[in-house]
Amino acid sequence: YNNFRKSMDSIGKKQYQVQHGSCSYTFLLPEMDNCRSSSSPYVSNAVQRDAPLEYDDSVQRLQVLENIMENNTQWLMKLENYIQDNMKKEMVEIQQNAVQNQTAVMIEIGTNLLNQTAEQTRKLTDVEAQVLNQTTRLELQLLEHSLSTNKLEKQILDQTSEINKLQDKNSFLEKKVLAMEDKHIIQLQSIKEEKDQLQVLVSKQNSIIEELEKKIVTATVNNSVLQKQQHDLMETVNNLLTMMSTSNSAKDPTVAKGEQISFRDCAEVFKSGHTTNGVYTLTLPNSTEEVKAYCDMEAGGGGWTIIQRREDGSVDFQRTWKEYKVGFGNPSGEYWLGNEFVSQLTNQQRYVLKIHLKDWEGNEAYSLYEHFYLSSEELNYRIHLKGLTGTAGKISSISQPGNDFSTKDADNDKCICKCSQMLTGGWWFDACGPSNLNGMYYPQRQNTNKFNGIKWYYWKGSGYSLKGTTMMIRPAGF
C-alpha cells in the first residue's frame, strides 16, 4: 500500500515521508523560522528618530536572512535533482509494472512536491521582500545616524565657543574685581587718614577749651571788666561747643549731643530721638563691625531697617555669595544690606518683614510677615517666614517652607538648573519659585514677558518686572 506522511523533526525542518512499495523516502525541507511570517505586522519604512537601532544588530539579522536564502536555494536544487532522478526510476518501474494505481500515487507525490516547491518559492519571495525592506530601513537609519552625528558635532562646536566666550568674560570680570579691590584699599587708606586728621583736630579743640576754661577761672577773680570778658569768653566757648556737636552730627547722624551711641537697628535709632529718614550706622551688640543702613522713620510708625531696595537699575544685583553676605550698593539708593548682619540681627529677637512693591502703572502693594529670620551661613541663610498679610497676594510669593539662599556662584536651589544664573540675582530660590526681587531691572515698556525680571508672582504674575521694591524689618513689639 501507499502512505504519505508529514511531520516535524527536532531542529524545526518539515519532514516529508513517502512510502512506496518496499521503499520509503524522507525529504527534509528547511523552514524560515528566523524570519517574520508574512502575516506579522511589520512596517518597512518605520524609522526611529532619536535613537536608531544598533547597527551591528541589524547587520547580524541581515546575515541570518542571507544564510536562510542560501540554504533554501541549495535545498531547492537538491530537491529538483532528486525529483528528476526519482522520476526516471519511477517511470521505468511504472512502464515495467504498468500498474494504474501506482501511477496515480506518483502523480499525487509529484503534485505535492510541486505544491511544496511553489510554497517554498513564495516564501522565498517574501524573504527577499523583507530583506529589501530591512536594507532600505538600515540605509535610512545610517543616514539618520550621520545627520544626528553632524548635529551633535555642531552643538559641541557651539558649546565650545560659548565656553571660550564665558572664560574670556570670566577673566575680564576677575581683572575688574581685582581693580576694584585695589581701589577699595586706597579709599580705606584715605578714610583712615581723614579720621586721624579729625582726631587731631578734636584734641586741639579740647585743649583750646581747657585753656579757655582756665582763663575763665582766672577772670572771675578780677573786676567788672574782667567779668565782662568772662561773659564774652563763655559765649565763645558755647559757640565752639555748638560748632563741635553740629560738625559731628553732620558727619554721622548716630552721634547725638556730642557722644557716640551704637544702635543695632533703625528701631533703636528711632527710639533715641532720631526720627528723620536717612542713612545711619548700625552695630550689632558685642560687635565692632558697622554697617550703613537706610532707616525709614515715617512709614507705618517708622523704625524700619531697609534690607533691600530696587528703584532704577543703577546697581547690578548679579553678585557673588560673598557680596550678598556682606552687602553691596548704595544705602540711599539701590542696595542689599547683607545676609550676615540680617541673620545675626533676626536671631537676637523677633522681627517682622515688610515687602513694599511698585508697578509701572502707579500701583503699590505690600506683603507683611509677622515673623522673619534668616538661618546662619552654615545653613545657607535659609529664610523663615510666618503669618502673611497684605495686599500683594494672599499666597506667599516666597516659597514655603523657606529655601536656602542661592547666588550665581552658590547653587542651593531645588532645581536641576541653576536658578540664580538663569533668572539672575541672589534669592531664596525654590525650583525656581514665584518670586525674585533681585532679578534684572527692566525699564518701562520692556517690563512684560520677562522671565528674569523683578518678580512677585502672586501680585503681578510671572512675566511682569516691577518698577520698585523695598524689603524692611522691624522688631515685632515696636
Epitope: M440, Y442, P443, Q444, R445, Q446, N449
Partner: antibody
C-alpha cells in the same frame, strides 16, 4: 509731515555745558516717548537718554548719568538735553528720535542731528 | 549690557545681487531687534522691527529673520540706493546698537 529739528550744538571746552533742543512738528509730542541718540565721528550709534510722554519717567545711559538731563515741554512741542561736565568722548552728532508708539526704544523718526564738539 | 555684534564689517556686492547681513546678540533678546539704514550725512532710517516686520514704506526686497541671539537682514536684489551702512539694535533690555555693516559697490 513728521519733522524734528535739533539745535544748540557747537564747540565747547571740557567741563563746559550745552543745552540741546529739538523742535517737533507734524505730530503731537505729548503722545510719544522721545529719545536722544548720538554718533561719534566715524563711529556707530549710541542711545543716550529717553523720556516718557508726560516726563514722569526718564532714563540715561550710565556714561552720562549725573551729567546729562533729558526734559521736555509738551506745550512748546520741544525736547531738551542739558549737558554739563562735558568730556572729549561726548563729541558726537546728537539726534533726537521719536519712539514708535507703545514700543520701547524703537525709533521710527529721526532729526538731522546737531554736532557737539568738546575740545580745548 | 547686551552687546550686539555685526558681521561682516564691510560687504562688497554688485547691483542686482543678494546681500546677507548678520547680527548676533550676547544674550537672548527674543525678537526684539530692529534694523536701520544710514547714508552719509543723513539720519538713520528704520527698516525692520520685531526681527522680521517691515516698517512703513520699506520695499519688499528688505527682509529680516531670526530670534534669540542670531539675526539676518537680507536684501534680495541690491539697488543703487541701497548702498549704505546698516545697524542692528536690540530693545529687549535697555537699548544698544551693533557697530554697523557697510554695504559697498563691488
Amino acid at each position: 509731515e513728521v519733522q524734528m529739528v535739533e539745535s544748540g550744538g557747537g564747540l565747547v571746552q571740557p567741563g563746559g555745558s550745552l543745552r540741546l533742543s529739538c523742535a517737533a512738528s507734524g505730530f503731537t509730542l505729548r503722545s510719544y516717548w522721545m529719545s536722544w541718540v548720538r554718533q561719534a565721528p566715524g563711529k556707530g550709534l549710541e542711545w543716550v537718554a529717553n523720556i516718557k510722554e508726560d516726563g514722569s519717567e526718564k532714563y540715561h545711559v550710565d556714561s552720562v548719568k549725573g551729567r546729562f538731563t533729558i526734559s521736555r515741554d509738551n506745550a512748546e512741542n520741544s525736547l531738551f538735553l542739558q549737558m554739563s561736565s562735558l568730556r572729549a568722548e561726548d563729541t558726537a552728532v546728537y539726534y533726537c528720535a521719536r519712539d514708535m508708539e507703545a514700543s520701547a526704544g524703537l525709533f521710527d523718526y529721526w532729526g538731522q542731528g546737531t554736532l557737539v564738539t568738546v575740545s580745548s | 549690557e547686551i552687546v550686539m555684534t555685526q558681521s561682516p564689517a564691510t560687504l562688497s556686492v554688485s547691483p542686482g545681487e543678494r546681500a546677507i547681513l548678520s547680527c548676533r546678540a550676547s544674550q537672548s533678546i527674543s525678537s526684539n531687534l530692529a534694523w536701520y539704514q544710514q547714508k552719509p550725512g543723513q539720519a538713520p532710517r528704520l527698516l525692520i522691527y520685531g526681527a522680521s516686520t517691515r516698517a512703513t514704506g520699506i520695499p519688499a526686497r528688505f527682509s529680516g529673520s531670526g530670534s534669540g541671539t542670531e539675526f539676518t537682514l537680507t536684501i534680495s536684489s541690491l539697488q543703487s540706493e541701497d548702498f549704505a551702512v546698516y545697524y542692528c539694535q536690540q530693545y529687549n533690555y535697555w537699548w544698544t546698537f551693533g557697530q554697523g555693516t557697510k554695504v559697498e559697490i563691488k
